[in-house]
């Protein structure tokens, strides 16, 4: 039961995390105009990975996409790549983990296969989370560097009375969404990996129990189940007889009217 709960919780946490990574990637507020000494502004600038926006105090907002690919900073391209890789891995991980869930039965899929799929999705979630955290951190580092550079050049070219004030940018909401979402995906992935260990049947899982079926006896001996480490099915471990004695986790793997096929 604990394994099922861990797997289910890992899946839900990862799902929330990946939804957050997608949201962060799409958000326009990766960097927002720093309002250092002026909390009220007539023109407010903010930028995302895909477009930059200007919101006037009148309420009018104008956004312009970055229609160039080669003209963009390499760091921005790298952040985009990391976030997209994170989303793709996360999406595949979600797909795999759906079939790996113990509460869902697909044909005669055995526990060892589910364990492998759970581990695979867990690793994918971990890498996805790390990609998102890395992407957001790279962008944050870029912002910090530019912030101090623009602070140093805050009042450049002051010819007499004329001042050219540079717009400084600080952390936008998307960065925090990205960090939290990446963290959740990472945690979800770790939970899936932990669940995988419990899912994979071990030698000590079963005591020798004698079963009687239609006039001749068949006995299960310890060592009948081994944890499979590869992908694909392990036919040696296939269960043929449905006896009355089952472990707590095994109860879930029998079809019922609530199962999805």
């Amino acid at each position: 039961m604990a394994v099922t709960a861990c797997q289910g919780l890992g899946f839900v946490v990862s799902l929330i995390g990946i939804a957050g990574i997608i949201a962060a990637t799409c958000m326009d507020q990766w960097s927002t105009q720093d309002l250092y000494n002026n909390p009220v502004t007539a023109v407010f600038n903010y930028q995302g990975l895909w477009r930059s926006c200007v919101r006037e105090s009148s309420g009018f907002t104008e956004c312009r996409g970055y229609f160039t690919l080669l003209g963009l900073p390499a760091m921005l391209q790298a952040v985009r790549a990391l976030m997209i890789v994170g989303i793709v891995l996360g999406a595949i991980g979600l797909l795999v983990s759906i079939f790996a869930l113990k509460c869902i039965r697909i044909g005669s899929m055995e526990d060892s296969a589910k364990a492998n799929m759970t581990l695979t999705s867990g690793i994918m979630f971990i890498v996805s989370g790390l990609c998102a955290i890395a992407g957001v951190s790279v962008f944050a580092n870029m912002l910090v560097t530019n912030f101090w550079m623009s602070t140093a050049n805050m009042y450049t070219g002051m010819g007499g009375m004329v001042q050219t004030v540079q717009t400084r940018y600080t952390f936008g909401a998307a960065l925090f969404v990205g960090w939290v979402a990446g963290g959740l995906t990472l945690i979800g992935g770790v939970m899936m990996c932990i669940a995988c260990r419990g899912l994979a049947p071990e030698e000590t899982n079963y005591k020798a129990v004698s079963y009687h079926a239609s006039g001749h006896s068949v006995a299960y001996k310890p060592g009948g189940f081994k944890a499979s480490t590869g992908f694909g099915s392990n036919t040696k471990n296939k269960k043929i007889y449905d006896g009355g004695a089952r472990t707590e986790d095994e109860v879930q793997s029998y079809p019922s009217k609530h199962d999805y096929v």
């Epitope: 009220v40 502004t41 007539a42 023109v43 930028q47 930059s52 050219t164 004030v165």
Partner: antibody, heavy 118, light 113 residues
């Protein structure tokens, strides 16, 4: 069409206060900032402040803080400016103006003349 | 506060002439985010409220005759009337709408001979 109708001229004594109104019609009153601008006789335009009727947020010109108080009544689509402790320096024409795209004052009221005299 | 300086304070021209008036700001009004200059021009005829002419330094408000043209960037701006008409008799104000407090220039009074 957008219209801003201001209250009539006021003649007040020094030290008194006055409340000018600006009734808006032809647009969603709550969704646009309303500006107040004054013009002393023979002088230029001076921004007093603005109010967002949707939530009551205000921005003031530092020179008018304590002198002018901006309010708005969404139910009647009317913006108000209360001027206190009036002196002869406050004698001017006061305009209300809607804040539109490009941070512009795109529609103006006809103006309210306030004369402070004993 | 951003100080807006207009020149000349007044000018007299004959109908049909081309007119230019200047407006300088103490700080740049160019917003890097959208490369727009947050400067507005108004026309105020005697006994009337001001009327919006030009916004974003060069965008003509709908209904404004095309003889009115705004130009400039950063701190130096110009309003040009290509062929002055009798009805253009007014005071022209430039306005900073880039940062609070909103500030106006002192105005340029246009008179027709």
């Amino acid at each position: 069409q957008v219209q801003l109708q201001q209250s009539g001229a006021e003649l007040v004594k020094p030290g008194a206060s006055v409340k000018i109104s600006c009734k808006a019609s032809g647009y969603a009153f709550s969704n646009y900032w309303m500006n107040w601008v004054n013009q002393r006789p023979g002088k230029g335009l001076e921004w007093i402040g603005q109010i967002y009727p949707g939530n009551g947020n205000t921005n003031y010109n530092g020179g008018f803080k304590g002198k002018a108080t901006l309010t708005a009544d969404k139910s009647s689509s009317t913006a108000y400016m209360h001027l206190n402790s009036l002196t002869s320096e406050d004698s001017a024409v006061y305009f209300c103006a809607r804040w539109g795209t490009g941070n512009t004052m795109d529609y103006w009221g006809q103006g309210t003349s306030v004369t402070v005299s004993s | 506060d951003i100080v807006m300086t207009q020149s000349p304070s007044s000018l007299t021209v004959t109908a049909g002439e081309k007119v230019t008036m200047s407006c300088k700001s103490s700080q740049s009004l160019l917003n890097s985010g959208n490369q727009k200059n947050y400067l507005t021009w108004y026309q105020q005829k005697p006994g009337q409220p001001p009327k919006l002419l030009i916004y974003w330094a060069s965008t003509r408000e709908s209904g404004v005759p095309d003889r009115f043209t705004g130009s400039g960037s950063g701190t130096d701006f110009t309003l040009t009337i290509s062929s002055v008409q009798a009805e253009d008799l007014a005071v022209y104000y430039c306005q900073n709408v880039y940062s609070y407090p909103i500030t106006f220039g002192s105005g340029t009074k246009l008179e027709i001979k």
